[in-house]
């Protein structure tokens, strides 16, 4: 049951973000997962690192992965997927998942290659009247249905405000998205929901738009959150661009 000979899925995440690494296997038998092992192979002659193991309903993150890794899959349904939070540069490499079924010698193995990019700027700057894109992508090898995307704003006036909401009701297959309050008609979803991308575009920026924007992407009971600080600078002076304006003229005494 070795999936390592096919080219493994790859994920590219920024430092500080989260990554969901899938480890789901299809089994014709009605056997449940007995044991799970996740290992990181950093490559470059570095020693393999143990990330997490699971047995007897006990999930144990190891060493520097403590408090940052969780099994997110439904273990009863052959899913040993791993959520890695607050990704660090040292987390880059190939993650190998091993799943064992009780009373079977076969081991199901799956690999995921994780690439780590430098941290994305958490603070953005925009001029009054301009437009700004705010990114919010949850990186996952698994195609999971986004059930909700929500953007919340908290500005200098302490009250929190809904900027944008997207719902997807699986049973009814209803999609519903809306921008709210003073953000009405100024916010559009620009990300691809089916790729766990809830990025938005805010246009006609006002000075009062400066503050914290928190995005949350819901995939069932899994929630990914990200906060962006938006700084709004006053409108740029509108200068009429003419050749005269570009080239200073030195006027003589008899010239007006």
């Amino acid at each position: 049951l070795n999936d390592l000979n096919v080219s493994p899925p790859e994920l590219t995440v920024h430092v500080g973000d989260s990554a969901l690494m899938g480890c789901v296997f299809q089994s014709t038998e009605d056997k449940c997962i007995f044991k799970i092992d996740w290992t990181l192979s950093p490559g470059e002659h570095a020693k393999d690192e143990y990330v997490l193991y699971y047995y007897s309903n006990l999930s144990v993150p190891i060493g520097r992965f403590q408090n940052r890794v969780h099994l997110m899959g439904d273990i009863l349904c052959n899913d040993g997927s791993l959520l890695l939070q607050d990704v660090q540069e040292a987390d880059q490499g190939t993650y190998i998942c091993e799943i064992r079924l009780k009373g079977e010698s076969q081991v199901f193995k799956k690999a995921v290659v994780l690439h780590v990019l430098p941290e994305e700027p958490k603070e953005l700057m925009v001029h009054v009247g301009g437009l700004i894109q705010m990114g919010c992508v949850f990186q996952s090898t698994e195609v999971k249905h986004v059930t909700k995307v929500e953007w919340i704003f908290s500005g200098r006036r302490a009250k929190e405000e809904i900027v944008f909401r997207y719902y997807h009701k699986l049973r009814m297959s209803v999609e519903y998205s809306q921008s709210w309050g003073h953000f009405q008609n100024r916010v559009n979803l620009v990300g691809d929901i089916f790729r766990n991308d809830g990025s938005i575009m805010l246009q006609g920026v006002r000075e009062s738009d400066g503050g914290n924007y928190t995005c949350s992407i819901h995939l069932g009971n899994l929630v990914f959150k990200k906060t962006i600080v938006l700084h709004v600078s006053p409108e740029e002076p509108r200068t009429l661009v003419t050749p005269a304006a570009l080239r200073p003229l030195v006027l003589g005494g008899n010239q007006l």
Epitope: D37, T39, V60, G63, Q66, R100, G103
Partner: antibody, heavy 115, light 106 residues
Framework: DVQLVESGAELVRPGASVKLSCKAL????????MHWVKQTPVHGLEWIGI????????VYNQKFKGKATLTADKSSSTAYMELSSLTSEDSTVYYC???????????????WGAG | MVLTQSPASLAASVGETVTITCRAS??????LAWYQQKQGKSPQLLIY???SLEDGVPSRFSGSGSGTQYSLKINSMQPEDTATYFC?????????FGAGTKLELD
Amino acid sequence: DVQLVESGAELVRPGASVKLSCKALAYTFTDYEMHWVKQTPVHGLEWIGIIHPGSGGTVYNQKFKGKATLTADKSSSTAYMELSSLTSEDSTVYYCTRRRYYGSSYWYFDVWGAG
Amino acid sequence: MVLTQSPASLAASVGETVTITCRASENIYYSLAWYQQKQGKSPQLLIYNANSLEDGVPSRFSGSGSGTQYSLKINSMQPEDTATYFCEQTYDVPLTFGAGTKLELD
């Protein structure tokens, strides 16, 4: 040197409870499972249960459920086992032992307390 | 999971080869360890994963086996090997031990 230092012998009345301690020295306490094992001339070595100090997770041998309660204090790197409703059957040697993970679902007791 | 260890006791001379066996009631897929316990002391790990020698253990000790049948071999018995030897399965909980084999010097 990696060591597990256990509390000394206890003299207790039947029906009472006792809390045994096991202090971990010279390693990161939260990185390893801590297990407790009972040894008697009749039953030999019997596994009581495990606590993982990092996650706080426990797994008990059904035989010792209700008899033993395992806890851990991360700040003092100490694991505890409380035994309740004591009888003469409980009077024996108890070991705490560290279980090392060797990868690929293999774990073994590599360090034992003195009992 | 029951581990049946044999023999319960044996005596061997210095330099002799000793073999102790351990049978599991189910396949334990190499998840077996051997421990040595000297009188009044706590057990010490000798062999893990059925055939891997723990660091610092003399090379005269070796482990073998698969499925349900495993064995510990001491290639050349030494006086300091006088002890009780236990096998342990870590395949499933509850973890279980063999009843032990008491090895004495002949």
